[in-house]
């Protein structure tokens, strides 16, 4: 059982430092922008995390949304990264949903930030660089010192 | 409780190949990984690499990639280990060892060698 | 590659002592570290994970502390079955590399 608690606006970078948006074709991309672009660029910028109390304590369970023209809401569904036009929901009566995602600190480093999905256990929110674009994919990954699968949150509020 | 049970020992010859297998007896979780690591006489442990059963994809150490097949039969919970051009310096034991998520009490992920074959004795001698 | 150089290579020590084995990362490896005991004619196992959360069944006499390169495994107060060669082994990144490994005496 997930339970929505309060939201922050975030911006997701990389640990390239290239930002994290979402494109004209809904697609989320990281791309090298500096701050006053990141701001143009609002609000494909600017994420929506939402978190939930989790009835089995696994980290902090987030939901990331984006409100372009509507809400879209990141989902790893068939372990495939895509944004579907949602709203996080108040409440989800499962332990596991594909839109949930536990956000943890990396070991030390309390700035930089992993997503394991909670649909699929060992799978995390990654960085991979396909031909000329860097997309955020789900990424089965037992390489946890992996910067791919690091990133930053700076809160927007 | 999950047990790893290897294949016997092997004596080669110089410039053969030998395959040594792990068999999962127990009930196991998936999201695993097998790793095969060897300790040869008066040395330390060696990591060679790991196969993830659920795609058979592989990462091999350097110095082994040319050598090194790792593959795994599902359908029987077998994992192998073939290693080619043997020369004497191959002469170790080899262990098959699980390689799974342990948790701490956060919830964040740790990865760990937790169950361990017996160890297979491979002398390479002409 | 990480090099993980594990300290001292050998110690002999006496019964109730206190033993430290230290290894040290070439570069931070993010707790991802474990400690491993092998005795003779047996395969390793597993002690401490996470750089500092003893495994299931092991002694509380075993501790794991340590983040970013440096990490330390204590034994503290030493008992005449805790002879036997003890291992990190950094998992942060491929190619996972263990220390060179403690040999552990009673004298």
């Known amino acids: 059982y997930f339970g929505k608690l309060e939201s922050k606006l975030s911006v997701i970078r990389n640990l390239n430092d290239q930002v994290l948006f979402i494109d004209q074709g809904n697609r989320p991309l990281f791309e090298d922008m500096t701050d006053s672009d990141c701001r143009d660029n609002a609000p494909r910028t600017i994420f929506i995390i939402s978190m939930y109390k989790d009835s089995q304590p696994r980290g902090m369970a987030v939901t990331i949304s984006v409100k372009c023209e509507k809400i879209s809401t990141l989902s790893c569904e068939n372990k495939i990264i895509s944004f579907k036009e949602m709203n996080p929901p108040d409440n989800i009566k499962d332990t596991k949903s594909d839109i949930i995602f536990f956000q943890r600190s990396v070991p030390g480093h309390d700035n930089k930030m992993q997503f394991e999905s909670s649909s699929y256990e060992g799978y995390f929110l990654a960085c991979e660089k396909e031909r000329d674009l860097f997309k955020l994919i789900l990424k089965k990954e037992d390489e946890l010192g992996d910067r791919s699968i690091m990133f930053t949150v700076q809160n927007e509020d | 409780q999950v047990q790893l049970v290897q294949s016997g020992a092997e004596v080669k010859k110089p410039g053969a190949s030998v395959k040594v297998s792990c068999k999962v007896s127990?009930?196991?979780?998936?999201?695993?990984?097998f790793h095969w690591v060897r300790r040869r006489p008066g040395k330390g442990l060696e990591w060679m690499g790991r196969i993830d059963p659920e795609d058979d994809s592989t990462k091999y150490a350097e110095r082994f990639k040319d050598r090194v097949t790792m593959t795994e039969d599902t359908s029987t919970d077998t994992a192998y280990m073939e290693l080619s051009s043997l020369r004497s310096e191959d002469t170790a034991v080899y262990y098959c060892?699980?390689?799974?998520?342990?948790?701490?009490?956060?919830?964040?992920?740790?990865?760990?060698?937790?169950?361990w074959g017996q160890g297979t004795l491979v002398t390479v001698s002409s | 590659d990480i090099q993980m150089t594990q300290s001292p290579s050998s110690v002999s020590a006496s019964v109730g002592d206190r033993v430290t084995i230290t290894c040290l990362a070439s570069?931070?490896?993010?707790?991802?570290l474990t400690w491993y005991q092998q005795k003779p004619g047996k395969a390793p196992q597993l002690l401490i994970y996470?750089?500092?959360k003893l495994q299931d069944g092991v002694p509380s006499r075993f501790s794991g502390s340590g983040s970013g390169t440096d990490y330390t495994l204590t034994i503290s107060s030493l008992q005449p079955e805790d002879e036997g060669d003890y291992y990190c082994?950094?998992?942060?990144?491929?190619?996972?590399?263990f220390g060179q490994g403690t040999k552990l005496e009673i004298k």
């Open positions: 996470g750089a500092n």
């Open positions: 570069e931070d490896i993010y707790t991802y």
């Open positions: 060892t699980t390689w799974r998520i342990y948790r701490d009490s956060s919830g964040r992920p740790f990865y760990v060698m937790d169950a």
């Open positions: 127990g009930e196991i979780s998936t999201g695993y990984y």
């Open positions: 082994l950094q998992g942060s990144k491929f190619p996972l590399t």
